[in-house]
């Protein structure tokens, strides 16, 4: 079954996908598509890279990480409910029947209706909205949605906990990750 990721309407959604290049700059073609991975390539492609660069992308879909180091995680800007569904990340590892494919399920929730912002809420809004926890592999990865409203003391406490907990693990360890070579 697909790993599930969540975002709110109006937010940017993040779908992790990684590989480790065999050598620096030795890139592998990757495609992202809306819909589960087909037998070859990606269906309904929204972004693709080749051995050198991103060679196709559509509006609102981009790679925020360093794809030259194998971070091919997809960011979808300003999501709407229509962005819900399965997304395919396909890594075309050279060789016979070597492709790695990952189906990620994006769930979009309606935006919360909130009262007029206060200083406390402004600070909350500035706090990172997407946290990723790491289980024992991609199948157990979960992405948390917006954090609940919390006060300054809670933020300080949470920051300390983050520093000492698995939540502080690099995002690289949380998504679909494969090593080449």
């Amino acid at each position: 079954s697909e790993v599930e990721y969540r975002a709110e309407v109006g937010q940017n959604a993040y779908l992790p996908c990684f590989y480790t290049p065999a050598a620096p700059g030795n890139l592998v073609p990757v495609c992202w598509g809306k819909g589960a991975c087909p037998v070859f390539e990606c269906g309904n492609v929204v972004l693709r890279t080749d051995e050198r660069d991103v060679n196709y992308w559509t509006s609102r879909y981009w790679l925020n990480g360093d794809f030259r180091k194998g971070d091919v995680s997809l960011t979808i800007e300003n999501v709407t409910l229509a962005d819900s569904g399965i997304y395919c990340c396909r890594i075309q590892i050279p060789g016979i029947m070597n492709d790695e494919k990952f189906n990620l399920k994006l769930v979009i929730k309606p935006a919360k209706v909130t009262p007029a912002p206060t200083r406390q809420r402004d600070f909350t809004a500035a706090f990172p909205r997407m946290l990723t926890t790491r289980g024992h592999g991609p199948a157990e990865t979960q992405t948390l949605g917006s954090l609940p409203d919390i006060n300054l003391t809670q933020i300080s406490t949470l920051a300390n906990e983050l520093r000492d907990s698995r939540l502080a693990n690099d995002l690289r360890d949380s998504g679909a990750t494969i090593r080449i070579g």
């Epitope: 073609p29 819909g35 087909p38 037998v39 990606c42 269906g43 309904n44 080749d50 029947m97």
Partner: antibody, heavy 119, light 107 residues
Framework: QVQLQESGGGLVKPGGSLRLSCAAS????????MTWIRQAPGKGLEWISY????????YYADSVKGRFTISRDNAKNSLYLQMNSLRAEDTAVYFC????????????WGQGTMVTVSS | EIVLTQSPSSLSASVGDRVTITCRAS??????LAWFQQKPGRAPKSLIY???SLQSGVPSKFSGSGSGTDFTLTISSLQPEDFATYYC?????????LGPGTNVDIK
């Protein structure tokens, strides 16, 4: 005009070899994945091999695995199928077809080249 | 391997008829189904991809529908040039497989 043209077919004895070519024109060849599909006389269509646009990713049908090799030369806009250890059941018209990377589906087909394996 | 079954295997129809061909997959294939048309001695021609999307240049008298395991190709008004064999193909799972074909001939 987008076009695919196969060549290299002919009569060959069982156990022999043949190399098919598919010349592409009218599009940026390296952007598209390519496949070989065959059709035995009076029969249906059978997919046999896939190669990605850059040539790195390759798939074969079990029926030809270890005997056939797909390759491409993007500088020459050409696709190839090296067929070794040919058998009578490989007798067919061989088509090359272009895969649309945007949808993952086949969109353009060549006219085909006939391969006959017989003693 | 996913097996595709087409029905009918052949049909006779007249010019102007509405013709429907079905393709059933042995397991779910999402919407990764294509339809091809082939005339005797000719190369196949791609008609439909993703179950219902028309390939560029294909007339709108052809339409596709379905998802999961059951799919349909419809020709709204059969013309003389439409008499041919029609194949469905799934490209959801390895290996890609094709149906046995449906031959549409003149009544």
């Amino acid at each position: 005009q987008v076009q695919l043209q196969e060549s290299g077919g002919g009569l060959v004895k069982p156990g022999g070899s043949l190399r098919l070519s598919c010349a592409a024109s009218g599009f940026t060849f390296s952007d598209y994945y390519m496949t070989w599909i065959r059709q035995a006389p009076g029969k249906g269509l059978e997919w046999i091999s896939y190669i990605s646009g850059g040539g790195g990713s390759i798939y074969y049908a079990d029926s030809v695995k270890g005997r056939f090799t797909i390759s491409r030369d993007n500088a020459k806009n050409s696709l190839y199928l090296q067929m070794n250890s040919l058998r009578a059941e490989d007798t067919a018209v061989y088509f090359c077809a272009r895969g649309n990377w945007g949808s993952a589906a086949l969109d353009i087909w060549g006219q085909g080249t006939m391969v006959t394996v017989s003693s | 391997e996913i097996v595709l079954t087409q029905s009918p295997s052949s049909l006779s129809a007249s010019v102007g008829d509405r013709v429907t061909i079905t393709c059933r997959a042995s397991q779910g294939i999402n919407n990764y189904l294509a339809w091809f048309q082939q005339k005797p001695g000719r190369a196949p021609k791609s008609l439909i991809y993703a179950a219902s999307s028309l390939q560029s240049g294909v007339p709108s008298k052809f339409s596709g529908s379905g998802s999961g395991t059951d799919f349909t190709l419809t020709i709204s008004s059969l013309q003389p040039e439409d008499f041919a064999t029609y194949y469905c193909q799934q490209y959801n799972s390895y290996p890609p497989t094709l149906g046995p074909g449906t031959n549409v001939d003149i009544k």
